[in-house]
C-alpha cells in the first residue's frame, strides 16, 4: 500500500453521546478518494489494544478487532466513497465511553482525528395532570436516565420561582441495574399556566412542558445532547 507517510489528509470528527442499550454513531468524515479499494478506515479506542473496527478494500476486516466490540460495529459502506467514515455502534454500553481515534489512509495520504464519546441514558419526559392527587398536581416521568440527573420545575407565570419546596423527585432503578426511572411531582399548580419539568445530567437536557387551561391540556417535549454538535 504505497503511500508516502508524509502526506496528510483532513479528517473531521464530532463529539457525541450514546444512549445505553441503543445504537450510537461515532461521526467521522474525510477527504474522499476516487477508488474505494484505496481507502482504509481504522477506528481505535484509548486504552483498548485491539482495533474497534477496520474497513479496507471495500469491506470490513475484523481479524484484529478487540473482543469488547465484536459483532457491534459497522461503517456505512456505501458512503465511504464520499468521505463518510462514521461508525455505527450497536447496543451501546456504559464502558464504550472514552476517546476514539478515526484513522484514515487513502491514495492521497493519511490523517486522523480524535473524538470524545460519552455514554449514559436519556429519555423524553412526559408531564401529566395527576387526577388521583388531593390537590392540583403535575407528574413528570422519564423512563431511562444515567447518571442520576437533576430535576427542576419552572413556570411561565411565576418566572424565576423556586419550586423545590413544592415538588418531590424520586429515582427508581430499572431492571438492568444501571439506568433509572425519574418521577417528579409538582404540587399546588394553578390553572392557565405553562409548567416545565427540566431533567439534566452531564450528557443530556430534556424538557417536558404542559399547558393547563380550563378547556384543554397541551404537552410538548424536547431533548438536547450537551457538549455535542451532533
Amino acid at each position: 500500500f504505497g503511500i508516502s507517510g508524509r502526506h496528510s489528509i483532513t479528517v473531521t470528527t464530532v463529539a457525541s453521546a450514546g444512549n445505553i442499550g441503543e445504537d450510537g454513531i461515532l461521526s467521522c468524515t474525510f477527504e474522499p478518494d476516487i477508488k474505494l479499494s484505496d481507502i482504509v478506515i481504522q477506528w481505535l479506542k484509548e486504552g483498548v489494544l485491539g482495533l474497534v473496527h477496520e474497513f479496507k478494500e471495500g469491506k470490513d476486516e475484523l481479524s484484529e478487532q478487540d473482543e469488547m466490540f465484536r459483532g457491534r460495529t459497522a461503517v456505512f459502506a456505501d458512503q465511504v466513497i464520499v468521505g463518510n467514515a462514521s461508525l455505527r455502534l450497536k447496543n451501546v454500553q456504559l464502558t464504550d465511553a472514552g476517546t476514539y481515534k478515526c484513522y484514515i489512509i487513502t491514495s492521497k495520504g493519511k490523517g486522523n482525528a480524535n473524538l470524545e464519546y460519552k455514554t449514559g441514558a436519556f429519555s423524553m419526559p412526559e408531564v401529566n395532570v395527576d387526577y388521583n392527587a388531593s390537590s392540583e398536581t403535575l407528574r413528570c416521568e422519564a423512563p431511562r436516565w444515567f447518571p442520576q440527573p437533576t430535576v427542576v420545575w419552572a413556570s411561565q407565570v411565576d418566572q424565576g420561582a423556586n419550586f423545590s419546596e413544592v415538588s418531590n423527585t424520586s429515582f427508581e432503578l430499572n431492571s438492568e441495574n444501571v439506568t433509572m426511572k425519574v418521577v417528579s411531582v409538582l404540587y399546588n399548580v394553578t390553572i392557565n399556566n405553562t409548567y416545565s419539568c427540566m431533567i439534566e445530567n452531564d450528557i443530556a437536557k430534556a424538557t417536558g412542558d404542559i399547558k393547563v387551561t380550563e378547556s384543554e391540556i397541551k404537552r410538548r417535549s424536547h431533548l438536547q445532547l450537551l457538549n455535542s454538535k451532533a
Epitope: Q42, L44, G47, L49, K110
Partner: antibody, heavy 121, light 107 residues
C-alpha cells in the same frame, strides 16, 4: 524520572512457578498499556504478554497461553507476570515495557532492566 | 501471527558510513512499526515509532521510512555508540511480533 524495575526472577525446576513483578514510577500507571517481553540467551526479542491500562484486556503469545497470567495492581503501580508449568524454553531475561501512545498503535518507549528466569533441573 | 523478517542479520560498517536495515512484514501493517536498538546486557531502546517518528532524545541521524509491508531504518552517519543490534516490531496485531534482529558490527 520514568522508571520500571523488575524483580522475582530466579532458578526454578521444570513444572515450577514464579511470579515476576515490575514496579512503575514517574508516570500515571493506569493510563498506559504494559507488556512483558523476553529474550532467551543469545536470541532475539519475543513478546510474551500485554495488558490494557485498566487491566480489563489481556493478551498472550501462543507459547505461554494457559500457563502465564498478566495482571496489574493500580494501587501499587505494579505489573505482574505469574508463570506456571515452567519449561526449559522459558529460560530468558524478562523485561517489562510501557506502551507509547494512547491507542496502542506505537512502540514500547520505557523498558525495565530485566530479570533473569532460569528453568533447569 | 504476522512474521517480521529483517535483513541483513548482521553487517559490518565503519564510523561515518550510511547504514540501511530493512524489515518486511508478512502482511500489511500500515505504519504500525517500531525500531529498537539493543546493546549487550542492556534493555532495548525505542528509536522509531509509527514507522517514521523519532522519540525525544533520539539523534536525528536515525530515520525510518516505509508503510504497508516494507520498512527501512537508516543511520545516516554511523557513530561509535551505534554498534548494537537493531529490531523491528509490529503493533498492528495484538499478537505483537519482533524481527529477528540485525547486528551492526565494526568493520
Amino acid at each position: 524520572e520514568v522508571q520500571l524495575l523488575e524483580s522475582g526472577g530466579g532458578l526454578v525446576q521444570p513444572g515450577g512457578s514464579l511470579r515476576l513483578s515490575c514496579a512503575a514510577s514517574g508516570f500515571t500507571f493506569n493510563t498506559h498499556a504494559m507488556h512483558w517481553v523476553r529474550q532467551a540467551p543469545g536470541k532475539g526479542l519475543e513478546w510474551v504478554s500485554a495488558i490494557s491500562g485498566s487491566g480489563g484486556s489481556t493478551y498472550y503469545a501462543d507459547s505461554v497461553k494457559g500457563r502465564f497470567t498478566i495482571s496489574r495492581d493500580i494501587s501499587k503501580n505494579t505489573l505482574y507476570l505469574q508463570m506456571n508449568s515452567l519449561r526449559a524454553e522459558d529460560t530468558a531475561v524478562y523485561y517489562c515495557a510501557r506502551l507509547l501512545g494512547r491507542f496502542g498503535e506505537y512502540g514500547m518507549d520505557v523498558w525495565g532492566q530485566g530479570t533473569t528466569v532460569t528453568v533447569s533441573s | 501471527d504476522i512474521q517480521m523478517t529483517q535483513s541483513p542479520s548482521s553487517l559490518s560498517a565503519s564510523v561515518g558510513d550510511r547504514v540501511t536495515i530493512t524489515c518486511r512484514a508478512s502482511q500489511n501493517i500500515y505504519t504500525w512499526l517500531a525500531w529498537y536498538q539493543q546493546k549487550p546486557g542492556k534493555a532495548p531502546k525505542l528509536l522509531i515509532y509509527d514507522a517514521t517518528n523519532l522519540p525525544t532524545g533520539v539523534p536525528s541521524r536515525f530515520s525510518g521510512s516505509g508503510s504497508g509491508t516494507d520498512f527501512t531504518l537508516t543511520i545516516s552517519s554511523l557513530q561509535p555508540e551505534d554498534f548494537a543490534t537493531y529490531y523491528c516490531q509490529q503493533s498492528y496485531s495484538t499478537r505483537w511480533t519482533f524481527g529477528g534482529g540485525t547486528k551492526v558490527e565494526i568493520k
